[in-house]
Interface confidence: medium
C-alpha cells in the first residue's frame, strides 16, 4: 500500500474497545496447558520450558490517530516459570534438586521466543488508511535472569522521539510484546 | 468515483431521535473510517468523531458523547448517525466524510452532500 | 483540543487582485515525524466543503495554482493570487496532528 511519507507511531491514552461482534478472543487461553518442554531438558539457558504460558491475546491497536481496521491476534508470554524439579519424573533426577538449590539467586521468566512480521491496516480519524509493519509473538519460551539482571523490556521498538503505539484491548490483560514499524 | 449520499432533510420536535444515513460507492467501504461532521446554521465545522468501518468501533469527540451514536450497515455500505433526545441547538447539517487512499493526514477529500436536521416543536 | 483561529473573519477582494488569510493554532502542529498536518477548506455557497490544500502547501488535485499555502508551528497562510468569481466562500482552516481533528471558523471571501 502506498503510505505517505514516514508516520511514526504516535500516541495518546486510550481506553479499552468493545470486541467487534464477529471477533472470537481467546484470552488468557493458555495453550497446551501451557508447559512446553525443550529436547534434553538441560540446555538451562533458554530452553528448559515448564510452566511457560502462552495466553492468545485479541486486540486492536492504536497509533492516537488511527486504529486497525481488524483485532490482531497474537501470544502473550506470561509469568514465571515452574522449576523442573517440582514435576515428577524429571529426566534429570536428583541433579536437578541440587542444581536448582544452588541457583536460588536466579529466576526464570517466560518471555518472548518466536515472531512473525506482518502488515496491518489502520482507520484513521480523517478518514483515510495507513498501514504498520509489526512484529506478532508466536511462541514463548524460558529464559534464566540473575535478580540483579535488569530484564530487557518487550516493548515496542522506540521509533525516533514517538510514544509507543497503543493497545485497544478486547479483554483485561494488557501486552507489551509487539514490535511496531512503519511500512 | 467515491461517492457519499446522505440521507434528506429532516424536521423534528425536541425529545425526538432522527438517523441520518450516509451510502457510500465507489471504494471497498470496510476499508477507509467514516467522519462526521457537523455545521450549525451561519457556522464553522465541527467535527463530531469518526467510526471504524470495519470494526465497528466508534470515537467520539468530547461535545458529542452520549445522544449521538455512529453506526453501520455494512452490507449495504452505509454509515448512520443518530441522535437522540434532540435539542434546539442540534439543528445543523450533517456531513459524512472520508480522506484519501493511504494518504493519513492529507485532508478530507470526500464529504456528503451534507443532511439538514432542524429541531423544532 | 488545538484550537484553530483564523482572520479575518470576512475578507472583500477585487477581482484580479491577491487575498490572504491567517489561521494560527494554540499549539504546534508539527508531528513528532516531521510533518504538519494543516489543511485549507472552501465551502461555496450552498455546497459540502472541498479540500484545497493539504498538509500546509500541497495542493490537491484539481485544485488551480493560484490557490497556495505556507507556514510551519503554529502560523500559516493561504494566499489567491488573483481572485476569481468562482473563489467567493467561505474558507476554512484543520489540523489533523492532534486528536481530536478540528477547524478554523472560517473566513468569508467576497467580491467587493
Known amino acids: 500500500f502506498k503510505n505517505d511519507a514516514t508516520e511514526i507511531l504516535y500516541s495518546h491514552v486510550v481506553k479499552p474497545v468493545p470486541a467487534h461482534p464477529s471477533s472470537n478472543s481467546t484470552l488468557n487461553q493458555a495453550r497446551n496447558g501451557g508447559r512446553h518442554f525443550s529436547n534434553t531438558g538441560l540446555d538451562r539457558n533458554t530452553r528448559v520450558q515448564v510452566g511457560c504460558r502462552e495466553l492468545r491475546s485479541t486486540k486492536y491497536i492504536s497509533d492516537g490517530q488511527c486504529t486497525s481496521i481488524s483485532p490482531l491476534k497474537e501470544l502473550v508470554c506470561a509469568g514465571e516459570c515452574l522449576p523442573l524439579p517440582v514435576l515428577p519424573n524429571w529426566i534429570g533426577g536428583g541433579y536437578g534438586t541440587k542444581y536448582w538449590s544452588r541457583r536460588s539467586s536466579q529466576e526464570w521468566r517466560c518471555v518472548n521466543d518466536k515472531t512473525r512480521t506482518q502488515r496491518i491496516q489502520l482507520q484513521c480519524q480523517d478518514g483515510s488508511t495507513r498501514t504498520y509493519k509489526i512484529t506478532v509473538v508466536t511462541a514463548c519460551k524460558c529464559k534464566r535472569y540473575t535478580r540483579q539482571h535488569n530484564e530487557s523490556s518487550h516493548n515496542f521498538e522506540s521509533m525516533s522521539p514517538a510514544k509507543p503505539v497503543q493497545h485497544h484491548r478486547e479483554r483485561k490483560r494488557a501486552s507489551k510484546s509487539s514490535k511496531h514499524s512503519m511500512s | 468515483q467515491v461517492q457519499l449520499v446522505q440521507s434528506g432533510a429532516e424536521v423534528k420536535k425536541p425529545g425526538a431521535s432522527v438517523k441520518v444515513s450516509c451510502k457510500a460507492s465507489?471504494?471497498?467501504?470496510?476499508?477507509?473510517?467514516m467522519s462526521w461532521v457537523r455545521q450549525a446554521p451561519g457556522q464553522g465545522l465541527e467535527w463530531m468523531g469518526w467510526?471504524?468501518?470495519?470494526?465497528?468501533?466508534?470515537t467520539y469527540a468530547d461535545d458529542f458523547k452520549g445522544r449521538f451514536v455512529f453506526s453501520l450497515d455494512t452490507s449495504v455500505s452505509t454509515a448512520y448517525l443518530q441522535i437522540n433526545s434532540l435539542k434546539a441547538e442540534d439543528t445543523a447539517v450533517y456531513y459524512c466524510?472520508?480522506?484519501?487512499?493511504?494518504?493519513?493526514?492529507?485532508?478530507?477529500?470526500?464529504w456528503g452532500q451534507g443532511t439538514l436536521v432542524t429541531v423544532s416543536s | 483540543d488545538v484550537v484553530m483561529t483564523q482572520s479575518p473573519l470576512s475578507l472583500p477582494v477585487t477581482l484580479g487582485q491577491p487575498a490572504s488569510i491567517s489561521c494560527r493554532s494554540s499549539?504546534?502542529?508539527?508531528?513528532?515525524?516531521?510533518?504538519?498536518?494543516l489543511h485549507w477548506y472552501l465551502q461555496k455557497p450552498g455546497q459540502s466543503p472541498q479540500l484545497l490544500i493539504y498538509?500546509?502547501?500541497n495542493r490537491f488535485s484539481g485544485v488551480p495554482d493560484r490557490f497556495s499555502g505556507s507556514g510551519s508551528g503554529t502560523d500559516f497562510t493561504l494566499k489567491i493570487s488573483r481572485v476569481e468569481a468562482e473563489d467567493v466562500g467561505v474558507y476554512f482552516c484543520?489540523?489533523?496532528?492532534?486528536?481530536?481533528?478540528?477547524f478554523g471558523g472560517g473566513t468569508k471571501v467576497e467580491i467587493k
Open positions: 484543520s489540523q489533523s496532528t492532534h486528536v481530536p481533528l478540528t
Open positions: 465507489g471504494y471497498t467501504f470496510t476499508t477507509y473510517g
Open positions: 466524510a472520508r480522506g484519501r487512499e493511504y494518504y493519513y493526514g492529507s485532508g478530507i477529500a470526500f
Open positions: 498538509k500546509v502547501s
Open positions: 499549539q504546534s502542529l508539527e508531528h513528532s515525524n516531521g510533518n504538519t498536518y
Open positions: 467510526i471504524n468501518t470495519y470494526s465497528g468501533v466508534p
